[in-house]
Interface confidence: medium
């Protein structure tokens, strides 16, 4: 079975401070997916942010990069200026 | 129109310290999305980064000159100020700093110091 | 010594294509996006490419990037005697909280 674990379930961050999240995939090959992330605010809402290749959701282009690191086997999210809003609960998934 | 200027001394005698200045103008130093770098060029060699001041004051550096470098700001003056003490002959160089907008990498570069130790 | 690796020298004649490499590792181009200086004789380097493949307004569309894994390449289309200058690429890297630079690409034009 595959599973994505994200490396850290707390990141504290500092505003304005490069942020990266990572997301470990366990018994696959990560290359073989499509990674996509989300992010859930307080209200529960889901929010699409990131797939590959450089596809991302309504206004996350400019403050986000997502990337994989085949070697590692990882998913990769970098939230360049992060500021009070970009709180939430983030999340990886996979798909074909 | 933003930009970047380098101000500080040509000659330096081993031993002492050096202390630039980087004046900038069209955008503000708290700015969450812009930053400051400093990098240095020796004469005939490659592009070295120094130290880096972040828009909420985090600062980092080079871990090669660590000990010997403080970046700090005064964001009344708009200016970026860059340490470096104990020099030497190997510190000649010229210095550039840098704003780092994100996404886009140094997108403005100030034209640089060129700087001499030597006794 | 440089934390990204680059080859020193690249050249071609007018017209032609030339590609410069970029090697780095897990912590800087494997998880953060790459960008391209410009640096003409005697003057300040110039921002060519960002976010690995994508340039500034004013940069010619002969410039072009591209990055896979922990790698990164430059790519001049229609070399012309202008372009003649030093190259570098950088990343920010995760370890050291800045940003890392390549030692050069000299790029000669025939």
């Known amino acids: 079975a595959i599973e994505l674990v994200p490396e850290h379930q707390t990141v504290p961050v500092s505003i304005g401070v490069p942020a990266t999240l990572r997301c470990s995939m366990k018994g696959e090959a990560i290359g073989n997916y499509y990674i996509n992330w989300y992010r859930k605010t307080q209200g529960n809402t889901m929010t699409f942010i990131y797939r590959e290749k450089d596809i991302y959701g309504p206004g996350f282009k400019d403050n986000f990069q997502g990337d994989i690191d085949i070697a590692k086997n990882l998913a990769v999210l970098k939230i360049l200026a992060p500021s009070e809003r970009d709180e939430g609960s983030y999340y990886c998934a996979c798909d074909t | 129109q933003v930009t970047l200027r380098e101000s500080g001394p040509v000659l330096v005698k081993p031993t002492e310290t050096l202390t630039l200045t980087c004046t900038v103008s069209?955008?503000?130093?708290?700015?969450?999305?812009?930053?400051v770098s400093w990098i240095r060029q020796p004469p005939g060699e490659a592009l070295e980064w120094l130290a880096h001041?972040?828009?909420?004051?985090?600062?980092s550096y080079n871990s090669s000159l660590k000990s010997r470098l403080t970046i700090s700001r005064d964001t009344s003056k708009s200016q970026v100020v860059l340490t470096l003490t104990n020099v030497d002959p190997v510190d000649t160089a010229t210095y550039y700093c840098?704003?780092?907008?994100?996404?886009?990498?140094?997108?403005?570069w100030g034209q640089g110091t060129m700087v001499t130790v030597s006794s | 010594q440089s934390v990204l690796t680059q080859p020193p020298s690249a050249s071609g004649t007018p017209g032609q294509r030339v590609t410069i490499s970029c090697s780095g590792s897990?912590?800087?181009?494997?998880?953060?996006?790459v960008n391209w200086y410009q640096q003409l004789p005697g003057t300040a380097p110039k921002l060519l490419i960002y976010?690995?493949?994508q340039r500034p307004s004013g940069v010619p569309d002969r410039f072009s990037g591209s990055k896979s894994g922990t790698s990164a390449s430059l790519a001049i289309s229609g070399l012309q005697s202008e372009d003649e200058a030093d190259f570098y690429c950088?990343?920010?890297?995760?370890?050291?909280?800045?940003?890392?630079f390549g030692g050069g690409t000299k790029v000669t034009v025939l």
């Open positions: 840098a704003r780092m907008r994100l996404p886009y990498g140094m997108d403005v």
């Open positions: 950088a990343a920010w890297d995760d370890s050291l909280n800045g940003p890392v």
């Open positions: 976010s690995n493949n």
């Open positions: 069209g955008f503000s130093l708290t700015n969450i999305r812009m930053s």
């Open positions: 001041i972040f828009s909420n004051d985090e600062k």
């Open positions: 897990t912590s800087n181009i494997g998880s953060n996006t």
